[in-house]
Interface confidence: medium
């Protein structure tokens, strides 16, 4: 708490300006009116206050708005936002995308802080869903934002918002997240033609089921190895050698370099060696000729 002391004669602030930058902590507390500060918050950003001084200014706003700041103040917080705690932010009701953008700009270039995460959470919950404009904004500032959401949270993303997603936004997503996003992407891009569709859907294919991969193999898509390596193992295993060859096109040669890594390794173990040999890549580890393959999982399902 800052001690209450009388403002020295002639030091009362009539406006928020740079004459305040060398005020001592107690002088700021005594000489700056909180209501004045609230109406001139936009000026704070042009004045190089020290961290200690920012703490005093925050304290004044906290006293003025104990239930949480109004959006008119929040929008102009600028770098004072960096002084807010998640607890402070939970008191806010942020509804304007402009306010969100203004505060994200302050944190630009830094990792997503707990403050920013709380702000985004409050904003998205207030809107009810992650609409396209919000998602556009969030992924512009934090490319990994989508992948920081739980599958449950991702379920609130409308398919129309998927158009805002760039490949790099999905770099850190795990299979569970892609399982949720893929059907949305499939729906979003369903009216596109073959090659355009593949370009858009490619980043989401880590959530694709076997039947969709089979369908893609009939469309001459020439999937690259990096995309293939991110596919769900359980979706790749049922694919035949011919289907994988069609799916990868000229990239099929890359299988050799990946034969010890999933999902290629597990897929090889499921193929007949004869079939693998037709690729001419020297892939080893398939089922020897003359062996009978029993699909026990199918047998269990039937019984």
């Amino acid at each position: 708490e800052v001690e209450k002391t009388a403002c020295p004669s002639g030091k009362k602030a009539r406006e928020i300006d740079e004459s305040l930058i060398f005020y001592k902590k107690w002088e700021l507390e005594a000489c700056v009116d909180a209501a004045l500060l609230a109406t001139q918050m936009d000026r704070v950003n042009a004045i190089p206050f020290t961290y200690e001084q920012l703490d005093v200014l925050k304290h004044k706003l906290d006293e003025l708005y104990p239930q949480g700041y109004p959006e008119s103040v929040i929008q102009h917080l600028g770098y004072l936002f960096l002084k807010m705690s998640p607890e402070d932010i939970r008191k806010w009701n942020v509804t304007s995308l402009e306010t969100l953008k203004a505060l994200l700009e302050v944190n630009k270039g830094h990792e997503m802080s707990p403050q920013v995460a709380t702000l985004i959470d409050r904003f998205v919950k207030g809107r009810g869903q992650l609409d396209k404009d919000t998602l556009d904004t969030l992924t512009a500032f934090y490319p990994g934002y989508l992948c920081s959401l739980s599958p449950e949270e991702l379920s609130s993303v409308p398919p129309s918002s998927i158009w805002a997603v760039r490949p790099q936004d999905l770099d850190t997503c795990d299979p569970r997240q892609l399982d949720v996003l893929y059907p949305k992407a499939r729906l979003a891009f369903q009216n596109m033609n073959g090659s355009e569709y593949f370009v858009k859907i490619q980043s989401f294919l880590g959530g694709a089921p076997t039947e969709d991969l089979k369908a893609l193999s009939q469309q001459n898509v020439s999937m690259d190895l990096a995309t293939f390596m991110k596919l769900r193992t359980d979706a790749v295993l049922p694919l035949t050698v011919a289907e994988v060859q069609k799916l990868l096109g000229p990239h099929v040669e890359g299988l050799k370099a990946e034969e010890r890594h999933r999902p290629v390794r597990d897929w090889i173990l499921r193929q007949r060696q004869d079939d693998l040999d037709t690729l001419g890549l020297g892939l080893q580890g398939g089922i020897p000729n003359g062996y009978l393959v029993l699909d026990l999982s199918m047998q269990e399902a039937l019984s």
């Epitope: 740079e18 930058i21 704070v44 950003n45 190089p48 206050f49 020290t50 961290y51 004072l80």
Partner: antibody
């Protein structure tokens, strides 16, 4: 090129005066608060004085208060330090330094090469 | 606010991990910067806000800490890293620097 170039250093007798200048280029000078930092021979760094972007606010370390005056001419992109009543302990390399823009960024991302002030009889 | 750096000097070899500490006489939040200075040269900003790496500074430099205790770490010392390192607080006026830590070749 973004740079700061100090001048005006030299040998002066105790009680004498000296005016240091710092010419800035490559950035919007008036947008930044500026400081003088000094370093006595073989010693550490000491912050001496600072001035706001417009020149309307100034601050001094206790060791130089009342003797040194910081000022700036934004039309000439130049920072000054007027040093009066100089003492032997003011002997140092004087650096002019640009501080980061807000928030509270009173640290220095650009320094001049420094100018040596020697106070000796 | 007084800043106390330790050690005042240290000898290390290329490839070593080097740690320098800076202790503030009172809490300064994360308002701490680290500089590198080579003989006859001006200081160069390495770290600000206790842990943010200045643009163009190699990633082998890192900073940590908050409140009163701070650390500068060089993960793998390179020949060009032999210099004197200073911490500086910018929480309040007057701005103050630590006494410096000289990193020498063993």
């Amino acid at each position: 090129e973004v740079q700061l170039l100090e001048s005006g250093g030299g040998l002066v007798q105790p009680g004498g005066s000296l005016r240091l200048s710092c010419a800035a280029s490559g950035f919007t000078f008036s947008s930044y608060a500026m400081s003088w930092v000094r370093q006595a021979p073989g010693k550490g760094l000491e912050w001496v004085s600072a001035i706001s972007g417009s020149g309307g606010s100034t601050y001094y370390a206790d060791s130089v208060k009342g003797r040194f005056t910081i000022s700036r001419d934004n039309s000439k992109n130049t920072l000054y330090l007027q040093m009066n009543s100089l003492r032997a302990e003011d002997t140092a390399v004087y650096y002019c330094a640009k501080n980061r823009p807000p928030p509270g960024y009173w640290y220095f991302d650009l320094w001049g090469r420094g100018t040596l002030v020697t106070v000796s009889s | 606010i007084q800043l106390t750096q330790s050690p005042s000097s240290l000898s290390a070899s290329v490839g070593d991990r080097v740690t320098i500490t800076c202790r503030a006489s009172q809490g300064i939040s994360s308002a701490l910067a680290w500089y590198q200075q080579k003989p006859g040269k001006a200081p160069k900003l390495l770290i600000y806000d206790a842990s943010s790496l200045e643009s163009g500074v190699p990633s082998r430099f890192s900073g940590s800490g908050s409140g009163t205790d701070f650390t500068l770490t060089i993960s793998s010392l390179q020949p060009e890293d032999f210099a004197t390192y200073y911490c500086q607080q910018f929480n309040n006026y007057p701005l103050t620097f630590g006494g410096g830590t000289k990193v020498e070749i063993k």
